[in-house]
């Protein structure tokens, strides 16, 4: 088999025609990157290399995932004689997977004379550009259409060597050089019409397996020169063994003990140490909506619940800024944790013309909606006139008090004349420090808050000269009746510290939608949660008793074992192959006949969709 098991992988480059240092430095860099390399993950760029350099170390390369750029070099031949595949996952100049340009020295005889890509039989994506290589021969004798998978692309080949020897007579007019060993191996244009990919001969039974790339030595997926998709221990497969497989006993997808991860075009049991697992791939870094976690010693990307954690430097002591202002507000975008403090001073809100800082656009304060934790203190001495609460901090859960303001304060709110309620609806802990809330002339509701419940130690409060409690009550500025006795941060059922009855997504309600309403719910403690979308709504009765698809009273679509499902399993990977089921008259999922390969409408062999396997052949697993 040409498809090996373990392969030396190296990173490519993305420099284009830019180079750093002299020719010697270029060569050393190239040698360091590609010595003993078999698969280039990225682009192979060979630019400005001298004729004196020994490039024989490149002959180990069998595959390049991106593009190949050969430009402005003066060596005579390119020792990529074992290169089989260019995948073209990235293009040069937006459409080329192989780009060869200006490889000659106008003042000397040194030039590229032969490509030497004798084993190149597949370019999976992208085109070919070979121009202005004054002495380069045997590029127009290559049948590029046999190599390029995309039939719509025209190779751009011209203005290269003119005085070239013909192909050897044994080559049939297609070659990489003048000798009999330079004949081009055709693996596509010579195939019988029955072959839908490549072939190893002209006969109808000499087709390569459809997972092969570049050709093969025989019909099996282990006979490929290279893999179209992934190489799994020497076999070419459309997907690496997936992380989840269907368990026919539990009717659920469960972790696959034999899972492998995609590392480029190779299936590996574990990712290289500097990579993390994202679903079933090895990636350098998690995407922006996921965060890196370690599970059983495995570094994985997990979707963040809401925004991914992002820690940002605050203001005040030990920081670059004294206050939040128009010059720094944008640095708080998507922050979930403030390392330090937040200070809101009049110079920040109104601006400081002497320091060329404009007034703060009050709308921009909404950036703080993502903040869940402040490790130091929160100090609000100035607030926009039209904003009557601090609801931009409605997701703030913890004030750490690791650094304190003035006489030991971790929460200080003073002289904000227009503020009528605090609106800190998620605040559940003031870990250390004192609370100072004074001289906010219109501020109500704060007397209702059980501050002792927020503080780890005895609450040390300095709360005075706000609107008198009696006046607030007279004006009806009291907690919503759905709030418990713990108090509230402001008006309405969304501002309660806790609820008298039930809560739904942070809002207090009389009751959950157990038996009526558009969306049905169940309760966990006093919290209402929606039933699984696969549960059928039961009129006048309980729709579900938990969150899973196995807690429904009735199914909206089909039932597979205890689980309500949108459709019965169709080709889901099981322990021993794909699994197919059909729904019976009572909408229960039942297994297809064991020889069905594309699903079925009933349990019998004649109910199979598409072709069934002949009885003698190994069938996919069904249950």
């Amino acid at each position: 088999s040409e498809v090996g098991n373990s392969q030396a992988v190296c990173a490519g480059t993305l420099n284009g025609l830019s180079v750093t240092g002299d020719a010697q430095h270029q060569y050393r860099t190239l040698h360091k990157m590609y010595n003993n390399c078999e698969i280039v993950m990225g682009n192979l760029e060979i630019v400005l290399i001298d004729h004196t350099q020994d490039l024989s170390f490149l002959q180990t390369i069998r595959e390049v995932t991106g593009y190949i750029l050969i430009a402005m070099n003066v060596f005579s031949t390119l020792p990529l004689r074992n290169l089989r595949v260019i995948r073209g996952t990235q293009f040069y100049e937006e459409k080329y997977a192989l780009f060869v340009l200006l490889n000659y020295n106008p003042n000397a005889t040194h030039a590229l004379r032969q490509l030497g890509l004798n084993r190149l039989t597949e370019i999976l994506a992208g085109g070919v550009y070979i121009e202005k290589n004054e002495q380069l021969c045997h590029v127009d004798t290559v049948e590029w259409r046999d190599i390029m998978r995309d039939p719509r692309l025209e190779p751009v080949v011209g203005d290269n060597g003119r005085a070239c020897a013909p192909c050897h007579e044994s080559c049939g007019g297609h070659c990489w050089g003048p000798g009999p060993e330079d004949c081009q191996q055709l693996t596509k244009t010579i195939c019988a019409p029955q072959c839908n990919g490549r072939c190893f001969g002209r006969a109808p039974n000499e087709c390569c397996h459809e997972e092969c790339a570049g050709g093969c030595t025989g019909p099996l997926q282990t006979h490929c020169f290279a893999c179209r998709h992934f190489n799994d221990s020497g076999a070419c497969v459309p997907l690496c063994p997936q992380p989840l497989i269907y368990n026919k006993l539990t009717f659920q997808l469960e972790p696959n003990p034999d899972t492998k991860y995609q590392y480029g075009s190779v299936c590996v049991r574990s990712c290289p140490h500097n990579f993390v697992v994202d679903q079933s791939s090895c990636v350098r870094a998690c995407p922006s909506n996921k965060m890196e976690v370690e599970k059983n010693g495995l570094k994985m990307c997990e979707p963040c619940a809401g925004l991914c954690p992002k820690a940002c430097e605050g203001t005040g002591a030990g920081s670059h800024y004294q206050t939040v202002d128009s010059s720094n507000i944008d640095s708080f975008v998507n922050c979930t944790k403030i390392l330090g403090n937040l200070d809101f001073l009049i110079t920040g809100l109104e601006g400081d013309p002497w320091r060329n800082i404009s007034a703060l656009d009050p709308e921009k304060l909404n950036v703080f909606r993502t903040v869940r934790e402040i490790t130091g203190y929160l100090n609000i001495q100035s607030w926009p006139k039209h904003m009557h609460n601090f609801s931009v901090f409605s997701n703030l859960e913890t004030i750490g008090g690791r650094s304190l303001y003035n006489r030991g304060f971790s929460l200080l709110i003073m002289k904000n004349d227009n503020v009528t309620s605090l609106g800190l609806r998620s605040l559940r802990e003031v870990s250390a420090g004192r609370v100072y809330i004074t001289e906010n002339r219109r501020l109500c509701y704060l007397h209702t808050v059980q501050w002792a419940a927020l503080s780890r130690r005895r609450a040390d409060l300095d709360i005075r000269n706000n609107k008198p409690r009696g006046k607030c009550q007279q004006e009806g500025k009291v907690c919503d009746p759905l709030c418990s006795a713990d108090g509230c941060w402001g008006p309405g059922p969304a501002q309660c510290l806790s609820c008298r009855h039930y809560s739904r997504r942070g809002v207090c309600v009389e009751s959950c939608s157990f038996t009526q309403g558009e969306t049905r719910e169940f309760a966990e403690g006093t919290e209402c949660f929606e039933c699984h979308p696969e549960c059928e709504r039961v009129e006048g009765g309980i729709t579900c008793n938990g969150s899973g698809a196995d807690t429904c009273t009735r199914c909206a679509h089909y039932r597979d074992g205890p689980h309500c499902v949108e459709r019965c399993p169709e080709g889901i990977l099981g322990e021993r192959g794909p699994i197919y089921k059909y729904p019976d008259s009572s909408r229960e999922c039942r297994p297809c006949h064991e020889n069905c390969t594309r699903g079925c409408t009933g349990p019998l062999l004649q109910d199979c969709l598409g072709d069934a396997l002949p009885s003698a052949r190994r069938a996919p697993t069904v249950i």
Epitope: I346, T347, Q381, N406, Y436
Partner: nanobody, 127 residues
Framework: EVQLVESGGGLVQPGGSLRLSCAAS????????IGWFRQAPGKEREGVSC????????YYADSVKGRFTISRDNAKNTAYLQMNSLKPEDTAVYYC????????????????????WGQGTQVTVSS
């Protein structure tokens, strides 16, 4: 360039009075709490009085309560410290300072919370 310039210091007999002025430039005076500090030879700098930027709330150290009065004129970008019934122990270099942090009840603006400082003016109370 930010500047705070103190004036009005001098030699005065015990029981006498002085009025210190602090003229500010280079920043938005109205937004800043103004504080007066003093430092006697061989002693640490101590807070004497401060006045809020917004509502004129003022703070006085126990040692000067009833004798000193702080005021400000935002139109003139100037703060004042009227010192009556002066005592020999009031002898010190008096500094004015400006803080973007506001002063409030029960707060005392500490030395490190002031952004800008003047050079100081000498007050000597002696017979």
């Amino acid at each position: 360039e930010v500047q705070l310039v103190e004036s009005g210091g001098g030699l005065v007999q015990p029981g006498g009075s002085l009025r210190l002025s602090c003229a500010a430039s280079g920043f938005t005076f109205d937004y800043y709490t103004i504080g007066w500090f003093r430092q006697a030879p061989g002693k640490e700098r101590e807070g004497v009085s401060c006045i809020s930027s917004r509502d004129g709330d003022s703070y006085y150290a126990d040692s000067v309560k009833g004798r000193f009065t702080i005021s400000r004129d935002n139109a003139k970008n100037t703060a004042y410290l009227q010192m009556n019934s002066l005592k020999p122990e009031d002898t010190a270099v008096y500094y004015c300072a400006a803080s973007a942090s506001d002063y409030g009840l029960g707060l005392e603006l500490f030395h490190d919370e002031y952004n800008y400082w003047g050079q100081g003016t000498q007050v000597t109370v002696s017979s």
